[in-house]
């Protein structure tokens, strides 16, 4: 593996007293970057498996707003605009880490949580089911 340089002042994570809780600065470093994926590219419209973006809002989570993709079609769009059902549009899912308020409604206390989000759609060959 790659050796990561370690600051001699870092706490020993193998110590049984190593904290399970940490202080996190929620001021986003690159806040100027667009958080609405619609603005960053138009792949969602140009793709052979186009998708729509939906705002998923949860005040008990940080970040509270996540944009999720839903495929527009069961099939894939051909160059002529026709839908080809011999191919399938499927969501591309990504596991991400978010902070969940715990206990609920507490402004400054969070627990790390993994969630699965759909970030776009792609075109795949369908699973063929053979009829006996």
């Amino acid at each position: 593996g790659i050796a990561i340089p370690r600051n001699s002042g870092c706490p020993n994570s193998e110590d049984k007293n190593f904290p399970r809780t940490v202080m996190v600065n929620l001021n986003i470093h690159n806040r100027n970057t667009s958080t609405n994926p619609k603005r960053s590219s138009d792949y969602y419209n140009r793709s052979t498996s186009p998708w729509n973006l939906h705002r998923n809002e949860d005040p008990e989570r940080y970040p509270s707003v996540i944009w999720e993709a839903k495929c527009r079609h069961l099939g894939c769009v051909k160059a002529d605009g026709n839908v080809d059902y011999h191919m399938n549009s499927v969501p591309i899912q990504q596991e991400i880490l978010v902070l969940r308020r715990e206990p609920r409604h507490c402004p400054n206390s969070f627990r790390l949580e993994k969630i699965l989000v759909s970030v776009g759609c792609t075109c795949v060959t369908p699973i063929v089911h053979h009829v006996a």
Epitope: N52, H54, E68, K70, R72, H73, L74, G75, N82, V83, D84, Y85, H86, N88, S89, V90, P91, Q93, S118, P126, I127, H129
Partner: antibody
Framework: QVQLVESGGGVVQPGRSLRLSCAAS????????MHWVRQAPGKCLEWVTL????????LYGDSVKGRFTISRDNSKNSLYLQMNSLRAEDTAVYYC?????????????WGQGTLVTVSS | SYELTQPPSVSVSPGQTASITCSGD??????VSWYQQKPGQSPVLVIY???RRPSGIPERFSGSNSGNTATLTISGTQAMDEADYYC???????????FGCGTKLTVL
């Protein structure tokens, strides 16, 4: 006006064939994916099959695969369902339905339905 | 294969809010549409793409979809809303459209 009208239903013996038709009017038929949906008496809706705008791409529900064939004639604004090897469980009202231009997960126009009874 | 589960029946008093649920594994990742079917009539689309209402459908009909459940909400329910309601989505694994088995809405 914008409508779909099914025809061709009736009483047929098990193992025999029947062809249903659906006449479309009032909209650009050739621009829409079309579907057949059926409903057995007193039962749920069941999707049967679909055909793409140009007729090149088709999908079938497991219960009818290999027995039913969907087709269309855009020059006649017509949709068809050829049903072979009919079984008692195929008894139902058959609806033709138009797929929404915004995606398949919506049928925005339905016909009045035609009843198919499979009985000896 | 993918399944959509609906309660067989829901009862509501006139003027009250009716909520009809539709459950399926990770349903929020799929689009859901809702259909109203009155006795002896063809189904009518009332909600598509989870929340959108076709023209001609009253504003009292609304939809939502999160987690494993999509919900059709009818606010200020009227006697004319008494009908069977079906949810629908698609399943990529079987490349087919899937209907729930319907919920009978009774306006008391």
């Amino acid at each position: 006006q914008v409508q779909l009208v099914e025809s061709g239903g009736g009483v047929v013996q098990p193992g025999r064939s029947l062809r249903l038709s659906c006449a479309a009017s009032g909209f650009a038929f050739g621009s829409y994916t079309m579907h057949w949906v059926r409903q057995a008496p007193g039962k749920c809706l069941e999707w049967v099959t679909l055909i793409s705008f140009d007729g090149r791409s088709k999908l079938y529900g497991d219960s009818v695969k290999g027995r039913f064939t969907i087709s269309r004639d855009n020059s006649k604004n017509s949709l068809y369902l050829q049903m072979n090897s009919l079984r008692a469980e195929d008894t139902a009202v058959y609806y033709c339905a138009r797929g929404s231009v915004r995606g398949e997960a919506a049928f925005d126009l339905w016909g009045q339905g035609t009843l198919v009874t499979v009985s000896s | 294969s993918y399944e959509l589960t609906q309660p067989p029946s829901v009862s509501v008093s006139p003027g009250q809010t009716a909520s009809i649920t539709c459950s399926g594994d990770n349903l929020r990742t799929k689009y859901v549409s809702w259909y109203q079917q009155k006795p002896g009539q063809s189904p009518v689309l009332v909600i598509y793409q989870d929340t959108r209402r076709p023209s001609g459908i009253p504003e009292r009909f609304s939809g939502s979809n999160s987690g494993n459940t999509a919900t059709l909400t009818i606010s200020g329910t009227q006697a004319m809303d008494e009908a069977d309601y079906y949810c629908m989505t698609w399943d990529v694994d079987t490349t087919s459209m899937i209907f729930g088995c319907g919920t009978k809405l009774t306006v008391l």
